[in-house]
């Protein structure tokens, strides 16, 4: 056959299906490939042609879509299963061509099991939610396209294994789930389970999100550094280990890039000659605010290294703040030991 | 059916205390919250606040922090609105309301009349 | 807070005109927006849920429309039990909040 260009096996696209239910899969090609879409190459005389690699095998084969109830179907750019079946895993290819023209891009499915709390491999979206923060939503997601707008499907929502009944906090309308006053205790997962008929026979879809309580942008400060502060001098002696640490609090911000770092005599460490190393933890709270720890480490301090600037910086999309180590050199203590116990009549 | 039954019309001095009852009927009580409406005279509606009737907690809306306490018997199906050092500005009818984020049922609504 | 407007304060119509009552948000509320008829001296009663939505007990003549922060009751040939008041209220955020109501009147 002729040349096409192949955009290869798009892993990005790791499509995941629940098995028996249905499943709508648009070709990629149009969505992150070509400039244009599926009606324009439709109108220019160009065809999408669909097949399939089984698991674990090698050989290409045609999509059969002649089976019964047209379990799996084409329309217009959606590859349909109506509804899928376990053996349906593989790769798939959508290719567009025409005599002049041909290009083509393979995605994985994989059509996963689930038990009866909902419990399967699939990766799940995670949705954050602010604590305390007012009435809250989450959607029941990705079941567009699925029935007509009228078709009036019946939606049940569950929290883990349990259809939520109790509505003082949470409650389930339609497509949506609101969170009246979102806590701790909210986390977890929610899964929807969307039923509709079509054709006189009735499908479902099931859609599990994690819900993750966060902190509120009402209550989020500007980093706070909780060390150094002025109460801890590092006191060290020539040739003595001098380690100080930088500890940072930010609040959860969404989006929000936290950032720590030194700067020595106003220099970042890696622009001077001194031998520092900069080791870094972080830790998490459960709304996941930030503690970011660095702690500057000289292994053999001297006596001008004693006389720098050690500032620890942070920045987030609150501000930037930074502050200052108290760094002296100790002072030998004077050696009259002997002197003052004889002075005191020791023997 | 469901019915949220308030207590009957209070006629109260400035600086007393009133206790409203709602009680509840018809459905599983400690799966809605229950909010409290204020009406004054010829007015409009205006939300007082809620309790959570599974934990008890409330939450009462800024105008209603002071002197205002809600409250449940949950073996009674019953939620109260208690008001402290009654003012004139008091008189008004208070309704009790299951939500479900619009509310669905409504108590009949209890008056209460503040006069010295 | 979110401020709910609701206008004319009185409409004065006759029985089987059909009017439109309408209640703004100060600020998008999505479809966040119920309805409630009320008779003098007796406690509110739910019409139109999330904008749109019907009521099941309530006459088909009630209707409602709109999302984000214009929002309109619609009455199909008024009858003599709706002369009443008719409040809005909103479910995006806390605290909720009602209009100031409509009073529909006989003209």
């Known amino acids: 056959s002729e040349r096409c260009d192949d955009w290869g096996l798009d892993t990005m696209r790791q499509i995941q299906v629940f098995e028996d239910e249905p499943a709508r899969i648009k070709c990629p090609l149009f969505e992150h490939f070509l400039k244009f879409n599926y009606s324009t190459a439709h109108s220019a005389g160009l065809t999408l042609i669909w097949y399939w690699t089984r698991q674990d095998r090698d050989l290409e084969e045609p999509i059969n879509f002649r089976l019964p109830e047209n379990r799996i179907s084409k329309e217009k750019d959606v590859l349909w299963f109506r509804p899928t079946l376990l053996n349906d895993t593989g790769n798939y290819t959508c290719m567009l061509r025409n005599t002049t023209y041909c290009s083509k891009v393979a995605f994985p499915l994989e059509v996963v099991q689930k038990d009866s709390c909902f419990n399967s491999p699939m990766k799940l979206p995670v949705h954050k939610l602010y604590i305390e923060y007012g009435i809250q939503r989450i959607t029941c997601p990705n079941v567009d396209g699925y029935f007509p707008s009228s078709v009036k499907p019946t939606i049940t929502w569950y929290m883990g294994c349990y259809k939520i009944q109790n509505f003082n906090n949470v409650i389930p309308e339609g497509m949506n789930l609101s969170f009246l006053i979102a806590l701790i205790s909210n986390n977890g997962n929610y899964t929807c389970v969307v039923t509709y008929p079509e054709n006189g026979r009735t499908f479902h879809l099931t859609r599990t999100l994690t819900v993750k309580v966060v902190g509120s942008p009402k209550n989020a400060v500007p980093p706070v550094i909780h060390s150094p502060n002025d109460h801890v001098v590092y006191e060290k002696e020539p040739g003595e280990e001098l380690l100080i640490p930088c500890t940072v609090y930010f609040s959860f911000l969404m989006d929000s890039r936290n950032e720590v770092w030194w700067t020595i005599d106003g220099k970042k460490p890696d622009d001077i000659t001194i031998d520092v190393t900069i080791n870094e933890s972080i830790s998490h709270s459960r709304t996941e605010d930030e503690t970011r720890t660095q702690i500057l480490s000289i292994k053999k301090v001297t006596s001008e290294d004693l006389k720098r600037s050690y500032v620890c910086h942070a920045r987030s999309a609150k501000g930037e703040v930074a502050k200052a180590a108290k760094v002296k050199q100790k002072v030998p203590a004077p050696r009259y030991t002997v002197e003052l116990a004889c002075g005191f009549g020791a023997t | 059916q469901i019915q949220l039954v308030q207590s009957g019309p209070e006629l109260k001095k400035p600086g007393e205390t009133v206790n409203i009852s709602c009680k509840a009927s018809g459905y599983t009580f400690t799966d809605f919250s229950m909010h409290w409406v204020k009406q004054a005279p010829g007015k409009g509606l205006q939300w007082m606040g809620w309790i959570n009737t599974e934990t008890g907690e409330p939450t009462y809306a800024d105008d209603f922090e002071a002197r205002f306490a809600f409250s449940l018997a949950t073996s009674a199906n019953t939620a109260y609105l208690k008001i402290n050092n009654l003012k004139n500005e008091d008189t008004a009818t208070y309704f009790c309301a299951r939500f479900f984020l619009h509310f669905d049922y409504w108590g009949q609504g209890t008056t209460l009349t503040v006069s010295s | 807070d979110i401020v709910l407007t609701q206008s004319p304060a009185t409409l004065s119509v006759t029985p089987g005109d059909s009017v439109s009552l309408s209640c703004r948000a100060s600020?998008?509320?999505?479809?966040?927006l119920h309805w409630y008829q009320q008779k003098s001296h007796e406690s509110p009663r739910l019409l139109i849920k999330y904008a749109s939505q019907s009521i099941s007990g309530i006459p088909s003549r009630f209707s409602g429309s709109g999302s984000g922060t214009d929002f309109t009751l619609r009455i199909n040939s008024v009858e003599t039990e709706d002369f009443r008041m008719y409040f809005c209220?909103?479910?995006?955020?806390?605290?909720?909040?009602f209009g100031a109501g409509t009073k529909l009147e006989v003209k």
């Open positions: 600020q998008s509320i999505n479809n966040d």
């Open positions: 209220q909103q479910s995006n955020n806390w605290p909720l909040t």
